[in-house]
Interface confidence: low
Amino acid sequence: SAPGEDEECGRVRDFVAKLANNTHQHVFDDLRGSVSLSWVGDSTGVILVLTTFHVPLVIMTFGQSKLYRSEDYGKNFKDITDLINNTFIRTEFGMAIGPENSGKVVLTAEVSGGSRGGRIFRSSDFAKNFVQTDLPFHPLTQMMYSPQNSDYLLALSTENGLWVSKNFGGKWEEIHKAVCLAKWGSDNTIFFTTYANGSCKADLGALELWRTSDLGKSFKTIGVKIYSFGLGGRFLFASVMADKDTTRRIHVSTDQGDTWSMAQLPSVGQEQFYSILAANDDMVFMHVDEPGDTGFGTIFTSDDRGIVYSKSLDRHLYTTTGGETDFTNVTSLRGVYITSVLSEDNSIQTMITFDQGGRWTHLRKPENSECDATAKNKNECSLHIHASYSISQKLNVPMAPLSEPNAVGIVIAHGSVGDAISVMVPDVYISDDGGYSWTKMLEGPHYYTILDSGGIIVAIEHSSRPINVIKFSTDEGQCWQTYTFTRDPIYFTGLASEPGARSMNISIWGFTESFLTSQWVSYTIDFKDILERNCEEKDYTIWLAHSTDPEDYEDGCILGYKEQFLRLRKSSVCQNGRDYVVTKQPSICLCSLEDFLCDFGYYRPENDSKCVEQPELKGHDLEFCLYGREEHLTTNGYRKIPGDKCQGGVNPVREVKDLKKKCTSNFLSPEKQNSKSN
């Protein structure tokens, strides 16, 4: 029988009446157009909704937008368009919401052609009030808040000027001209690239990388011959043109650009690209594109300095610069990532790593599924996950994989079961152990979301027809109840729940269509009465993450330690609550060779935990570039995995000697870097 339809499924008592009392409809007095929704702050209940409608006239497009505000998680909305003087808001800039619980919001208005600059509306009280401010420039990008101080904003102008505000957009100052890209770093630092000659495009590969740590009072040039730059975790990366040809290399800095080291990664040509797939304070996943229009490349993982890299995964699917990759961080379990590879036969397969890129494997076939036509052997196959690439190919996949840090172990994704990803209509699968095992959760494509830290999963069928039914599960997707939330079906456009998965409210968005008009409508359902009581100690059970062999003393050891979590029992129907904190108990493991990556010049043969010297480097001195000096590496082939906490056990020796020689790096060495003040 289909999931959720067998006899073992207990029904939630009287749920129809409970949900009916907690279902709130809001019909927006709007023609359909487009709608965008933003949550303002965390646990505030404040939602802003911007609807826009374009009327194409003979010579121009006339636009109209409305702004609505809710302070009860979407149950009721108030039209606050008058607070922004009924101005048409530019949706391409979205609503710029301030970090944390600052309560700050910036909306960018559409202005008439001849105006001197743009116009913004600013709020610092969770959109209760707005102040209109005329800008001395036309913005090219959305206002960017400093992560450290929400009063500090930066924006690029259509004239490529870098503008900064120190008082939340009240007053603006142009701190630099000819700027291509600008980003906030830590401690209110701004990094940006500048061009000298024609334009950003013309000077690509000849840009300069600048830094200001005092909002534009003084500057330091920290790099030349720059193609692009990026920030990830505590690392600053720059791709730099080589002197002699059109290739470029990655350089990395961990001190805000004062000193640089050349990353031990392959150089790339004009048509290739680098991409930071994921980064934290410990390490980086870097994709290096293969030459030619192959659509794939190689994933490398870094050491703790971002300099020495190990090959992690070959034939990694990544179509073009800024194109599609399925790389997904499974946030519900430490060390887990999922992505796709392009196999030799041109089919796409899903791979998963549980140890931060150390080893990759196929996803285990779900117990309750059979292999499809892509499988050569009908009894042996794997689960393959649909992510960004499938969505870009317009497959019947409404959502990417979903996981939440506070819903420990839960991963939900569309997939197919075979030897490769299938274009047939996918089903929805769930894992409750971070991707080790999977179960078919729902037949056919669905939208899905996690509420109450995993206590409730909500789903809506993906259909071209109007819908009026929502499905929910209180036992991590084993059993499903259906609730008809309206008599009149709506054309569904999206599910919205507060980011962080702590809420018990879900908003169903869509539009109604009648002969004469169509209107936006939302239904907000509060599940608080379904989970009648607060969870108690007896509702939780101890779960060892990454457990694959309970007999083994080292069972659950990943990156040098194991973690036991308190997890809600599937049979418990209770509220984790908004203040729920994941309870975990870590314990350190003994070191084994699995806790070490292969050092520069070494590699791991398949199915072997030992690192052996690369044949082409045998007998050579291992020398590499570090902080602009050449270093000599004495190693027996191992280095500790970044973030690995193991102690004792195996302890390979590693020593680095300074060769006291300058590297022939293309980068500015620190002593050549210049500073200037405004």
């Epitope: 089919s347 036509a373 274009v423």
Partner: antibody, heavy 129, light 107 residues
Framework: QVQLVQSGAEVKKPGASVKVSCKAS????????MSWVRQAPGQGLEWMGI????????SYAQRFQGRVTMTRDTSTSTVYMELSSLRSEDTAVYYC??????????????????????WGQGTTVTVSS | EIVMTQSPATLSVSPGERATLSCRAS??????LAWYQQKPGQAPRLLIY???TRATGIPARFSGSGSGTEFTLTISSLQSEDFAVYYC?????????FGGGTKVEIK
């Protein structure tokens, strides 16, 4: 085992319609497209169209557009092909064939094709006045 | 639509010899190509898919190669049961189209 069983031979007059059935067994019916292919006496194979058993969506070859209708009944795992306004040149053996139809999403820039891996025994349709 | 052209129309080969059949597409079909074998009075049987992968249960003497517009089916050592008509078929763009077929007969 996996098999497709088609309905029996038909003799029709010009202008009439014929409906051929194809019953699938031994696999999950909703996981595979079904193609229809015909073969006139002494001629080669000609693809007519394809039906997706889940939604029932179809794609027909241009030359059959307007005359052919492909449907499915998931409760009986059966696919049907109806051809109307028959003429003598429609005399042929009609085959249904399980078609993973590019079931392996290939990347990038093309699909991966698995071929029509299971065929029905064929249904002979004779159009004669 | 994509036109598939097979050559030769007829191939006379002695048992035990090698047979090479060609299929050309009017535009690139990438590797979205299949080969079928059909014997008189029977339904076609899938031999090769994805241009080069043997279908389940197909003997190793059958091999497919090519990509884009030029494809080849090779039967390394003809057995008596291999004398039949062979069709190529593309599935790059709808409508799927077949080649006219190559008849492999006993010399």
């Amino acid at each position: 085992q996996v098999q497709l069983v088609q309905s029996g031979a038909e003799v029709k007059k010009p202008g009439a319609s014929v409906k051929v059935s194809c019953k699938a067994s031994g696999y999950t019916f909703t996981k595979y497209y079904m193609s229809w292919v015909r073969q006139a006496p002494g001629q080669g194979l000609e693809w007519m169209g394809i039906v997706n058993p889940i939604g029932g969506s179809t794609s027909y070859a241009q030359r059959f557009q307007g005359r052919v209708t492909m449907t499915r009944d998931t409760s009986t795992s059966t696919v049907y092909m109806e051809l109307s306004s028959l003429r003598s040149e429609d005399t042929a053996v009609y085959y249904c064939a399980r078609d993973p139809s590019g079931i392996g999403l290939a990347g990038p820039f093309s699909r991966y094709y698995y071929g029509m891996d299971v065929w029905g025994q064929g249904t002979t349709v004779t159009v004669s006045s | 639509e994509i036109v598939m052209t097979q050559s030769p129309a007829t191939l006379s080969v002695s048992p035990g010899e090698r047979a090479t059949l060609s299929c050309r597409a009017s535009q690139s079909v990438s590797s979205n190509l299949a080969w079928y074998q059909q014997k008189p009075g029977q339904a076609p049987r899938l031999l090769i898919y994805g241009a080069s992968t043997r279908a389940t249960g197909i003997p190793a003497r059958f091999s497919g190669s090519g990509s884009g517009t030029e494809f080849t089916l090779t039967i390394s050592s003809l057995q008596s049961e291999d004398f039949a008509v062979y069709y190529c078929q593309q599935a790059r763009l709808g409508p799927w189209t077949f080649g006219g077929g190559t008849k492999v007969e006993i010399k």
